[in-house]
């Protein structure tokens, strides 16, 4: 058995077979080039379809696998923290937030009350906090990531709120809505100093920020355009205005991802001039979200990343670089603004 | 705007291959997403989806026609074929096209061509 | 592959009333993977909703869908004359995609 000596030089799993000797990976791990080694990819994307949340490795040529996940329905919105390699997802047919670690294993449901359309999502990691979005209740709320602590912070006026982004460092949510005027909003990330950023845009989705380059991106369902502004909403630009049916949308160093309904695709161009473009994976009917799994999209420093900002329960960023401890429903704050009480 | 119309013979024997053509105008298949999809109805009966074809030449068949049917497209005609082998009876229906604007939804449908199968 | 079962078979009704049309798979079929149809008798199909609750270019507001899982309907708040057809649900969450056996809304 070649397996025997020296593991057939293999990094990780050595297969013997009659056709001969082949490496394999565990998973969450990915064979490179020269058939032998496993690494962790360093980046790759995540998507969403249907019962399914697959990724595609941007390094290596091995795409389009299923991670292991049992239960799953509907998968609709996405998102992941990099210190734990966890993945979450909201399920609009069973109503829930989940979360599992990259390999499949410790599923479990982090949210599974309250919620109708939780359609965005998105994850707080320097808080470790989740943001959702649900277009049913009409509400914005946050919990802890393991789904304790849960306060509804925007609720007034809200009008079909569906794509969310976060920007920890800076203190901002951002979120665009689908009612009856399409928009895209910003408010510090308790809630509170709400405002209108796009307001003549059409159902926006695939709401994504460029940290690096302070941009925002999203596709927009009314005019099929992939659009970009600053963080304040101005400098706008078209990056792609001859798409069908782009849909959801993510960003990664030079370029922007995204899917495209009629298409049946996957694809990425230059984030500035939408030059360039690739068809990362074909054949998908109905990607709902996508993400790129990365580090680099997950850096930054606030108060909240130190100890909690010594919040007992919620410690939510605030601009410019500050943040508020917040309760629970039905908590209240005591005057030493650190603690909560029970009702 | 969208338009598509099926062309083919009226009467088939039984064992013959049948061969419509769908010709559209409004659209394209070239890169801009999209399909075109065959369905059948039988007299009085429910509709049946056959098969589509997409933009990038992804094809689809239904599981119980699938060993007897064959699509493609000639994208610089705008046309669309399908070919049904062993045609029997039971086969005899108004076939229609239609535009896969959407993944398996159909927004555009041509007028149908009914097809009678009879010795 | 998926049956959907349509129900009732007729509906008799007049001008002006609500009309409910009902639609279950015989499995889960997620809330935005169903489409609704409208046929008159030597026409072909139109296109009314797609996505379960999207609403087709052009189809009238008294047109509605809802429903998620195994249960839709599809709601015609007040009959208009030409609004008296055969309609058929198709499910395209899993392939093959199919559909109903149609319900007609014939007038009273």
């Known amino acids: 058995n070649p397996c025997a000596e020296e593991n057939g030089g293999c990094s990780h799993l050595c297969l013997y077979r009659p056709q001969g000797l082949r490496c394999a990976c565990p998973i969450g791990f990915e064979l490179i080039s020269d058939m032998k080694t496993c690494i962790v990819p360093e980046a790759f994307l995540l998507f969403s379809r249907r019962a399914d949340i697959r990724r595609i490795s941007l390094e290596t040529n091995n795409n389009n696998v299923a991670i292991p996940l049992t239960g799953v329905k509907e998968a609709s919105a996405l998102d992941f923290d990099v210190t734990d390699n966890r993945i979450y997802w909201t399920d609009i047919s069973l109503k829930t937030i989940s979360r599992a670690f990259m390999n499949g294993s410790a599923l479990e449901h982090v949210v599974e009350f309250g919620l109708d359309y939780p359609e965005g999502m998105a994850v707080d990691w320097l808080g470790k906090n989740l943001y959702w979005a649900d277009t049913g209740t009409n509400r914005i709320e946050v919990s802890k990531l393991d789904g304790q602590h849960r306060q509804v912070l925007v609720w007034k006026d809200l009008d079909s709120p569906r794509a969310l982004a976060l920007d920890p460092a800076e203190g901002f949510m951002y979120w665009t809505e689908w009612g009856g005027k399409p928009k895209i909003d910003r408010a510090a990330m308790d809630g509170s100093e709400r405002t209108t950023l796009v307001p003549n845009v059409g159902r926006a989705n695939g709401l994504t920020i460029d940290y690096a380059k302070r941009r925002l991106y999203w596709t927009d369902l009314d005019t099929n355009l992939i659009e970009s502004s600053n963080m304040l909403g101005l400098n706008r630009e078209v990056i792609a205005d001859d798409l069908p049916h782009p849909f959801g949308l993510t960003q990664y160093q030079d370029y922007i991802y995204w899917t495209d309904w009629s298409r049946r695709s996957i694809e990425r161009a230059n984030k500035t001039s939408g030059q360039n473009r690739t068809i990362i994976q074909g054949h998908l009917d109905y990607v709902m979200d996508i993400l790129v799994f990365h580090s680099s999209r997950q850096s930054g420093w606030n108060e909240c990343a130190s100890s909690n900002g010594h919040c007992s329960h919620l410690c939510l960023a605030v601009p410019v670089g500050g943040f508020v401890c917040g309760c629970p429903a039905h908590y209240s704050l005591n005057a030493d603004n650190r603690t909560c009480s029970a009702p | 705007q969208v338009q598509l119309k099926e062309s083919g013979p009226a009467l088939v024997k039984p064992t013959q291959t049948l061969t419509l053509t769908c010709t559209f105008s409004?659209?394209?298949?070239?890169?801009?997403?999209?399909?075109v999809g065959w369905f059948r109805q039988p007299p009085g009966k429910a509709l049946e989806w056959l098969a589509w074809?997409?933009?990038?030449?992804?094809?689809s068949y239904s599981t119980s026609l699938k060993t007897r049917l064959t699509i493609s497209k000639d994208t610089s005609k705008n046309q669309v074929v399908l070919t049904m082998t062993n045609m029997d009876p039971v086969d005899t229906a108004t076939y229609y096209c239609?535009?896969?604007?959407?993944?398996?939804?159909?927004?555009?449908w041509g007028q149908g061509t009914l097809v009678t199968v009879s010795s | 592959d998926i049956v959907l079962t349509q129900s009732p078979a007729t509906l008799s009704l007049s001008p002006g009333e609500r009309a409910t049309l009902s639609c279950r798979a015989s499995?889960?079929?997620?809330?935005?993977?169903l489409a609704w149809y409208q046929q008159k008798p030597g026409q072909a199909p139109r296109l009314l909703i797609y996505?379960?609750?999207n609403r087709a270019t052009g189809v009238p507001a008294r047109f509605s869908g809802s429903g998620s899982g195994t249960d839709f309907t599809l709601t015609i708040s007040s009959l208009e004359p030409e609004d008296f057809a055969t309609y058929y649900c198709q499910q395209y969450y899993d392939y093959p995609q199919t559909f109903g056996q149609g319900t007609k809304v014939e007038i009273k």
């Open positions: 239609a535009r896969m604007h959407l993944p398996l939804v159909f927004d555009s």
């Open positions: 996505g379960a609750s």
């Open positions: 074809i997409d933009w990038d030449d992804d094809k």
């Open positions: 499995q889960f079929i997620g809330s935005r993977y």
């Open positions: 409004g659209f394209s298949l070239s890169n801009r997403g999209g399909g």
